[in-house]
Interface confidence: medium
């Protein structure tokens, strides 16, 4: 049935899906706070621009009786049930914010006549790439993949003089939603990462991972995994590690590495951590104070989703254009808007661009130090520390093939 959009005559509504199954286990109250904070800012910005309009959010909750796993496993049906709820109420906003699970976003996109924009804090999987009316405000798997290929091929830096073409990927099935889809993308045989590598094997058992650390017959020195330092320690413990091993720990949504009092534990010395550059002042931003470091990014994405809508609404109203058109639905891409903690850039496909940071543990100071940064928007690496105090021989990253270390 045709659902009317509450999106005209000076009144603009945002439909926010509050799903029990979510990419991060964030209390819905915190997400509500994020949305309300965003609404205040949007209203102020519109008012200051001389646009006397009303902007509100409707929070759509699922009953939670059937879909109560809490993670993303039963999110497909929950998302569709919420859409049905909207349809039955004959009430849809100008924009849909949520869902965050890849399964539900993919299915909802497939099963609906999307004449309105969809903004997601999550939907990390490759199956949500290149969707015309979907905007993703947390780094999707495609961005990670492009960094890894770029870094593997790099061979002209003082600390990386070899191109790599091999890798192990550790994936045991207990990952968080973001990690699950990041590793899924690396595992997929048709993905860009797999296409560019000559050798890639997925390690699914703890023992497989542990054996590789000292296996003289290993096919690669490089192991990619996803999670925090504690996750690595549970797996690796204090086991001895061959000197040529490089572990790439993907931990994008964790800015604890940048806090002043953080010391890197000894088991992190063979590890390069890939994370996101913290916003200019994210660590002392008032909004993020009562959120954990990981969930900060999730709630922030909801807030930025509201600000993005406000940004587009302002442009269309100032140009005298209609909001309930395919043009509006397709406009949430290839732009930069003022986010809560600084400018936010979206690529041609509506996916957020960011600065990824590769950290190493300094053997001198036992602190995490920035080795290089990578701008996802231009697919370019920028070295930061030209003389890193690595654990690896000659302060250079080893070759990825055993027995051909730095010469």
């Amino acid at each position: 049935s045709q659902v009317s959009q509450n999106c005209h005559n000076g009144s603009y509504e945002i439909s926010v899906l509050m799903m029990g199954n979510s990419a991060f286990a964030e209390p819905l109250k915190n997400l509500e706070d994020a949305v309300n904070e965003g609404l205040e800012i949007v209203r102020g910005r519109l008012q200051n621009a001389g646009l006397n309009v009303t902007v509100n959010a409707t929070f759509m909750y699922s009953d939670g009786l059937i879909h109560n796993s809490g993670d993303c496993r039963s999110s497909t049906c929950e998302g569709l049930d919420l859409l049905r709820k909207i349809s039955n109420a004959q009430r849809m906003g100008c924009v849909l914010i949520g869902p965050s699970c890849t399964y539900s976003t993919f299915q909802m996109y497939l099963d609906t006549e999307l004449s309105y924009p969809m903004i997601s804090a999550g939907s990390f999987g490759l199956s949500c790439d290149y969707k015309e009316t979907l905007t993703r405000l947390m780094s999707p798997a495609r961005k990670l993949m492009y960094f890894l290929v770029n870094f593997w091929k790099t061979n002209d830096l003082p600390f990386k003089t070899y191109s790599w073409s091999t890798s192990y990927v550790y994936k045991n099935g207990t990952e968080t939603e973001d990690c699950f889809w990041y590793l899924n993308a690396l595992e997929a045989s048709v993905s860009y990462f797999s296409h560019e590598l000559g050798f890639k094997v997925v390690l699914r058992q703890d023992k497989e991972f542990q054996d590789i650390l000292m296996d003289h017959n290993r096919k690669s020195n490089v192991i990619i995994m996803c999670g925090g330092p504690e996750f690595l320690y549970k797996l690796k413990g204090d086991r001895a590690v061959a000197e040529d091993i490089v572990i790439i720990l993907v931990d994008l949504f964790n800015d604890q590495y940048f806090e002043d009092n953080v010391t890197a534990p000894d088991y992190m010395k063979n590890v390069l951590v890939l994370t996101l550059s913290p916003g200019n002042s994210l660590l002392n931003s008032s909004f993020s104070r009562n959120l954990s470091p990981t969930k900060r990014d999730f709630a922030l994405a909801y807030l930025n989703g509201i600000l993005l809508f406000g940004h587009m609404l302002k442009i269309f109203l100032e140009n005298g254009e209609n909001i309930t058109t395919p043009k509006f639905a397709h406009a949430f891409r290839n732009l930069t808007f003022e986010g809560y903690d600084g400018p936010v850039t979206l690529d041609d496909w509506g996916d957020v661009d960011s600065t990824m940071v590769l950290l190493y543990t300094s053997v001198d100071t036992k602190k995490y130090k920035v080795l290089l940064t990578y701008d996802t928007h231009v697919n370019k690496t920028y070295p930061v520390d030209m003389s890193p105090t690595f654990t690896w021989k000659n302060s250079k990253l080893p070759n990825d093939i055993t027995g051909r270390g730095p010469q």
């Epitope: 800012i41 102020g44 008012q47 916003g279 002042s281 994210l282 993020s288 600084g342």
Partner: nanobody, 121 residues
Framework: EVQLVESGGGLVKPGGSLRLSCAAS????????MGWFRQAPGKEREFVSS????????YYADSVKGRFTISRDNAKNSLYLQMNSLRAEDTAVYYC??????????????WGQGTMVTVSS
């Protein structure tokens, strides 16, 4: 342009109380969020508390939760920080800060000159 002027600092004994005020003037209609930061001698400036203009949503640093209360009076364009159960480690210069709708509220655009709070017996 917005100007911020703090007052109310001083010397107080541990366990005592103080109330800081911040008067805002200028283009105050553009202000979204106001807050307090502090800087102890030899340390970096740190977030203390903030409050939004419309809904008065508040945030506090863990170190002051339950002891400090932030409030604002929009009619008077003023911000307040009620500080109870003061400790020696609360000694610092306290700065009033404000950010506009047009800038990122995570970053404060306007700052006061600061008022000194000393907690000592």
């Amino acid at each position: 342009e917005v100007q911020l002027v703090e007052s109310g600092g001083g010397l107080v004994k541990p366990g005592g109380s103080l109330r800081l005020s911040c008067a805002a003037s200028g283009r105050t209609s553009t202000i979204h969020r106001m807050g307090w930061f502090r800087q102890a001698p030899g340390k970096e400036r740190e977030f203390v508390s903030s409050i939004s203009r419309v809904s008065s949503t508040t945030y506090y640093a863990d170190s002051v939760k339950g002891r400090f209360t932030i409030s604002r009076d929009n009619a008077k364009n003023s911000l307040y920080l009620q500080m109870n159960s003061l400790r020696a480690e609360d000694t610092a210069v306290y700065y009033c800060a404000a950010s506009e709708y047009e800038v990122s509220p995570g970053k404060s655009k306007y700052w006061g000159q600061g008022t000194m709070v000393t907690v000592s017996s």
